[in-house]
Amino acid sequence: AVNGTSQFTCFYNSRANISCVWSQDGALQDTSCQVHAWPDRRRWNQTCELLPVSQASWACNLILGAPDSQKLTTVDIVTLRVLCREGVRWRVMAIQDFKPFENLRLMAPISLQVVHVETHRCNISWEISQASHYFERHLEFEARTLSPGHTWEEAPLLTLKQKQEWICLETLTPDTQYEFQVRVKPLQGEFTTWSPWSQPLAFRTKPAALGKDT
């Protein structure tokens, strides 16, 4: 296993899920592999079966408990092992010590809704899902709005440098269909990364009032 052709990357959602991806060039697609998690100061351990996601990569979710339960803390270290079946025995392919709160990727924000819409502006709110209470207010958000004739990649990013679960979009065009997405990231963690984007919220601005006849 000591070569540059394999990669093992995991993230913690801050509550009760560790998601892992294992990639190995030249590995057989039908190889049976799993991830085993052993925390250094907990009585439980957990296993998940790696399932293929592409030609040379596998993924699985370590479900540590109920979705909103706080299963790990900032002082925990989890030893993660990739094991693959070779005949009747399991072969260890990789061993990684993993500090959960240095490797955070939260769930995508949920419950997006239009609070108020006008001709040129729209107020939208959302909620964070399965996020640890440890963060208190130490979160940031990025948002983007899809305008007609553009792609998501072209949409400018709006950054909210605090825990603010709403936004007021301005300078919109009247009677126009838009879509909106948001993602979240804790401020702590060496390898912490952005959550996936939320499901898009579609909304339409109100038409401009008709001018009086002259």
């Epitope: 540059g4 394999s6 990669q7």
Partner: nanobody
Framework: QVQLQESGGGLVQAGGSLRLSCAAS????????MGWFRQAPGKEREFVAA????????MYAVSTEGRFTCSRDNDKNTVYLLMNSLKPKDTAVYYC????????????????????WGQGTQVTVSS
């Protein structure tokens, strides 16, 4: 750039423990990923463990069988290797190494990835 000095090696009976230390001086320790390698007589240098700049991820050689723990203290400019349940096959010179390039802690690095090396400390495990 940093200079590295290992300590903590010695003679230990099989089943015993040792903690190796690697002290860094002369640079910004937290900007380096750190690794441990070992070389037994007549054998090639072998990867043992590597940890990222902040210690958020640490990869271990499968041969360590979960008996070793690598950690770092960026305030003390030191990286450690705690070795438990030692076996005669663990007998080797243990080297500390620093990597100036970015290391994600998601793969097994090669010795050529490391730029700076200590002088090594001898570990002998008797049966």
């Amino acid at each position: 750039q940093v200079q590295l000095q290992e300590s903590g090696g010695g003679l230990v009976q099989a089943g015993g423990s040792l903690r190796l230390s690697c002290a860094a001086s002369g640079g910004t320790f937290s900007s380096y990923a750190m690794g441990w390698f070992r070389q037994a007589p007549g054998k090639e240098r072998e990867f043992v463990a590597a940890t990222t700049r902040g210690g958020g991820r640490t990869m271990y050689a499968v041969s360590t069988e979960g008996r070793f723990t690598c950690s770092r203290d960026n305030d003390k400019n030191t990286v450690y290797l705690l070795m438990n349940s030692l076996k005669p096959k663990d007998t080797a010179v243990y080297y500390c190494a620093a990597m100036t390039s970015y290391y994600s802690g998601t793969y097994y690095p090669d010795s050529s990835d490391f730029d700076i090396w200590g002088q090594g400390t001898q570990v002998t495990v008797s049966s």
